[in-house]
């Protein structure tokens, strides 16, 4: 009795879904009551399928409502673990253990990454100095630095702060501001750059024609 995996290295984006598969030999019709399936991650029990049903009482709380064994796949000889709304803490080495006559196990590694994709931006103006403050904010993992550039590719000096996200402990909240004298329709870019060549995420900020001055600061 041997379990096989067609893939044992998985990558998923934060907040996405992943289905990891272990295949086992099934002849003719599957006898669910002779099948045992365990899925674990390090010391956390995720799935315990015995006597034709899942025992949710043993499931680690961090996987509650997010992890399930796809029962229809069992009849095809696949123990498929689906995890939804993937978190950074889900990264690690998973183990599928299957008993069906014989017994075997396989390890699968899951890597979770969180690109700085949803970049929020804000442009405000100081009514006294007419200096513009440009702000970009995004969440991701690992840490990123923010590079500010102008449309003529000059690198500008901004100020970046990194805090932990409210959504998840490991996630970083990166905010960067650039103070600059700018004219209408000028274009600036903030680029969230993690160390290495893999991926950058850039937002374009266009200075508007005229920014409304906050009501409390208007002169009448």
């Amino acid at each position: 009795f041997t379990i096989t995996v067609s893939k044992d290295l998985y990558v998923v984006e934060y907040g996405g879904n992943v289905t990891m598969e272990c295949k086992f030999p099934v002849e003719k019709q599957l006898n669910l009551f002779a099948l045992i399936v365990y899925w674990e991650m390090e010391d956390k029990k995720i799935i315990q399928f015995v006597n034709g049903k899942e025992d949710l009482k043993v499931q680690h709380s961090s996987y509650s409502q997010r992890a399930q064994l796809l029962k229809d796949q069992l009849f095809l000889g696949k123990a498929a673990l689906q995890i939804t709304d993937v978190r950074l803490q889900d990264a690690g080495v998973y183990c599928c253990l299957i008993g069906y006559g014989g017994a075997d196990y396989k390890r699968i590694t899951l890597k979770v990454h969180a690109p700085y994709r949803n970049i929020s931006q804000r442009i405000s103006v100081d009514p006294v100095t007419s200096e513009h403050e440009l702000m970009c904010q995004a969440e991701g993992y690992p840490e990123a630095e923010v590079i500010w550039t102008s449309s003529d590719h000059r690198v500008l000096s901004g100020k970046t702060t990194i805090t932990n996200s409210n959504r998840e402990e490991k996630l970083f909240n990166v905010t960067s501001t650039l103070n600059i004298n700018a004219t209408a329709n000028e274009i600036f870019y903030c680029t969230f750059q993690r160390s290495g060549p893999e991926e950058n995420n850039t937002a374009e900020l266009v200075i508007p024609e005229r920014l409304p001055v906050p009501a409390s600061e208007r002169t009448h």
Partner: antibody, heavy 119, light 107 residues
Framework: EVQLVESGGGLVKPGGSLKLSCAAS????????MSWVRQTPDKRLEWVAT????????HYPDNLMGRFTISRDNAKNNLYLQMSHLKSDDTAMYYC????????????WGQGTLVTVSA | DIVLTQSPATLSVNPGDSVSLSCRAS??????LHWYQQKSHESPRLLIK???QSISGIPSRFSGSGSGTDFTLSINSVETEDFGMYFC?????????FGGGTKLEIK
């Protein structure tokens, strides 16, 4: 700028041991899985070992399991490879490698340290 | 282990030529295939990730294609700085494996 600087290579006799080190800088070391990759004299590249960002799990190819041990010290930004019972076919340039955050490939390589196993 | 076979082993071209390098996997690896360049006496560097995704800082003349078992690295109008070794690597299954390499040399 990401920098990976290997050290500890040299000439060792068959059956001997050697510990390689890699000093990392220019990135948040504790956020990335790290690997050792070697290049044999005939220029073939071979994955040697990988360790997760926190150091809680490691991977080795079957032929190196038990002889090689990868470890890391996140406080010092250092990666290590302990090699024992060395054989002549372990002769290679050993590269320290930073794995990508979005997959299992090498984003950055060190300059390498040469290990020669010979009587 | 998944075996990656690169061909040709050596490719002799003139600067300005366009070339294609092949990498074939012993089983399907979806798009989990990456390309590296290694110049003489240097460390490898990442060129293409996930079969076709470009890498910042890499010239646009380098492109990748393929899925499943057959992959291609294309260099549009080779420049003198492009000569060296090219390796493919799979990240579908542990252990990650590399192809034997293709040497791109001046004709």
């Amino acid at each position: 700028e990401v920098q990976l600087v290997e050290s500890g290579g040299g000439l060792v006799k068959p059956g001997g041991s050697l510990k390689l080190s890699c000093a990392a800088s220019g990135f948040t070391f504790s956020s990335y899985a790290m690997s050792w990759v070697r290049q044999t004299p005939d220029k073939r590249l071979e994955w040697v070992a990988t360790i997760s960002d926190g150091g809680s799990y490691t991977h080795y190819p079957d032929n190196l399991m038990g002889r090689f041990t990868i470890s890391r010290d996140n406080a010092k930004n250092n990666l290590y490879l302990q090699m024992s019972h060395l054989k002549s076919d372990d002769t290679a340039m050993y590269y320290c490698a930073r794995e990508s955050y979005d997959g299992y490939y090498v984003a950055n390589w060190g300059q390498g340290t040469l290990v020669t196993v010979s009587a | 282990d998944i075996v990656l076979t690169q061909s040709p082993a050596t490719l002799s071209v003139n600067p300005g030529d366009s070339v294609s390098l092949s990498c074939r996997a012993s089983q399907s690896i979806s798009n989990n295939l990456h390309w590296y360049q290694q110049k003489s006496h240097e460390s490898p560097r990442l060129l293409i990730k996930y079969a076709s995704q470009s890498i910042s800082g890499i010239p646009s003349r380098f492109s990748g294609s393929g899925s499943g078992t057959d992959f291609t690295l294309s260099i549009n109008s080779v420049e003198t700085e492009d000569f060296g070794m090219y390796f493919c690597q799979q990240s579908n299954s542990w252990p990650q494996t590399f192809g034997g390499g293709t040497k791109l040399e001046i004709k």
